[in-house]
């Protein structure tokens, strides 16, 4: 029960986290104009990974996409890449984890398979969360560097061109969304990995047990995995516990016609 709860909670937390990573990646407010100690302007600038926007006091907002790839800073490209990798891994992790959930039965999937899938999705969530946190942190570092550079030189004259007020940018809402979302995805992934341990068949060696079916011998090797003929429903690796006790989730397996081919 605790394993199911841990797995379910891990899935939900990761789902929220990945939704947050997607939201952060799409948001325009990665960096926002710093209003502290600045002349009060009737224009508010903010930038995202994909476009920059200007909101006028009049209420009009104009956004312009970055229609160049080569002209963009390498750091911005790296952040984009990290966020996309995070989303892709997270999405695959979600897909895998849906099939791994104990509360969902798909055919005759075994606990060991579900355990492996849970672990896989958990690792994917952890990597996804780390990608998001890394991406947001790289962007934040870029902002801090630029902030102090522009503070040192508030007004710049570009090679004889017209002076422009050096707009300083500070952390936007997307950074905080990204950090929180990355953290949630990471936590969700850890929870999935913990749940995997509870789902996985124990590796302890048990006494060899023989079960004699009429006309056919099926041996149970130490380690508890059934050596079957490789056909039909009996190919499932069922765990035999001492005294023949089974877990409540385990369905008894009877010899089928395929065992006697």
């Amino acid at each position: 029960m605790a394993v199911t709860a841990c797995q379910g909670l891990g899935f939900v937390v990761s789902l929220i986290g990945i939704a947050g990573i997607i939201a952060a990646t799409c948001m325009d407010q990665w960096s926002t104009q710093d209003l502290y100690n600045n002349p009060v302007t009737a224009v508010f600038n903010y930038q995202g990974l994909w476009r920059s926007c200007v909101r006028e006091s009049s209420g009009f907002t104009e956004c312009r996409g970055y229609f160049t790839l080569l002209g963009l800073p390498a750091m911005l490209q790296a952040v984009r890449a990290l966020m996309i990798v995070g989303i892709v891994l997270g999405a695959i992790g979600l897909l895998v984890s849906i099939f791994a959930l104990k509360c969902i039965r798909i055919g005759s999937m075994e606990d060991s398979a579900k355990a492996n899938m849970t672990l896989t999705s958990g690792i994917m969530f952890i990597v996804s969360g780390l990608c998001a946190i890394a991406g947001v942190s790289v962007f934040a570092n870029m902002l801090v560097t630029n902030f102090w550079m522009s503070t040192a030189n508030m007004y710049t004259g570009m090679g004889g061109m017209v002076q422009t007020v050096q707009t300083r940018y500070t952390f936007g809402a997307a950074l905080f969304v990204g950090w929180v979302a990355g953290g949630l995805t990471l936590i969700g992934g850890v929870m999935m990995c913990i749940a995997c341990r509870g789902l996985a068949p124990e590796e302890t060696n048990y006494k060899a047990v023989s079960y004699h079916a009429s006309g056919h011998s099926v041996a149970y090797k130490p380690g508890g995995f059934k050596a079957s003929t490789g056909f039909g429903s009996n190919t499932k690796n069922k765990k035999i516990y001492d005294g023949g006790a089974r877990t409540e989730d385990e369905v008894q397996s009877y010899p089928s016609k395929h065992d006697y081919v």
Epitope: P39, V40, A42, F60
Partner: antibody, heavy 118, light 113 residues
Framework: QVQLQQSGAELVKPGYSVKLSCKAS????????INWVRQRPEKGLEWIGW????????KYNENFKGKATLTTDKSSSTAYMQLSRLTSEDSAVYFC???????????WGQGTLVTVSA | DIVMTQSPSSLTVTAGEKVTLSCKSS????????????LTWYQQKPGQPPKLLIH???TRESGVPDRFTGSGSGTDFTLTISSVQAEDLAVYYC?????????FGAGTKLEIK
């Protein structure tokens, strides 16, 4: 078409208050800010402040804080400016104008002449 | 506050002449975010409210004759009337729309001979 209809001329005694109105028509009142501008005789234009009818957000020129109070009534699509503690210096024509691209003022009311005299 | 300096303060011209009105701001009105200059030109005829001619320093408002052209960037701006007509008799104001408080120039009075 867009129209801003302002209230009629006012003759006020010094120290008193006056409330000017600006009724908007021809557009969605809550979507655009309303600015107020003062023009004194033989003087230029002075921006007083703006109000967004949608959420009531205001921004004032520091020189008019405490002097002007901007409000709106969404039901009647009307913007108001109350001028308090009037002096002869406040005698002027007051315009309301709708915010537009580039923070410019696109549609103007016809103006309200306020005369402060004992 | 941003000071908007207009020159000349008044100007007398004959119909058909080309006129250039100047406006200088004490600080740049160029926004780095969208590379637009937040300067507006208005025309005020006697007994009327001001009328918007040009916003963003060079974007002509719809319905404004194309003889009116705005140019300039940063701190120096000009309004050019390519061929002055009798109906252009008015006071022309420039406005800072970038910094609060939004400030106007003292105006240039255009008179026709």
């Amino acid at each position: 078409q867009v129209q801003l209809q302002q209230s009629g001329a006012e003759l006020v005694k010094p120290g008193y208050s006056v409330k000017l109105s600006c009724k908007a028509s021809g557009y969605t009142f809550t979507n655009f800010g309303i600015n107020w501008v003062r023009q004194r005789p033989e003087k230029g234009l002075e921006w007083i402040g703006w109000i967004f009818p949608g959420d009531g957000t205001t921004k004032y020129n520091e020189n008019f804080k405490g002097k002007a109070t901007l409000t709106t009534d969404k039901s009647s699509s009307t913007a108001y400016m109350q001028l308090s503690r009037l002096t002869s210096e406040d005698s002027a024509v007051y315009f309301c104008a709708r915010f537009y691209y580039g923070n410019s003022f696109v549609n103007w009311g016809q103006g309200t002449l306020v005369t402060v005299s004992a | 506050d941003i000071v908007m300096t207009q020159s000349p303060s008044s100007l007398t011209v004959t119909a058909g002449e080309k006129v250039t009105l100047s406006c200088k701001s004490s600080q740049t009105l160029l926004n780095s975010g969208n590379q637009k200059n937040y300067l507006t030109w208005y025309q005020q005829k006697p007994g009327q409210p001001p009328k918007l001619l040009i916003h963003w320093a060079s974007t002509r408002e719809s319905g404004v004759p194309d003889r009116f052209t705005g140019s300039g960037s940063g701190t120096d701006f000009t309004l050019t009337i390519s061929s002055v007509q009798a109906e252009d008799l008015a006071v022309y104001y420039c406005q800072n729309n970038y910094f609060y408080p939004l400030t106007f120039g003292a105006g240039t009075k255009l008179e026709i001979k």
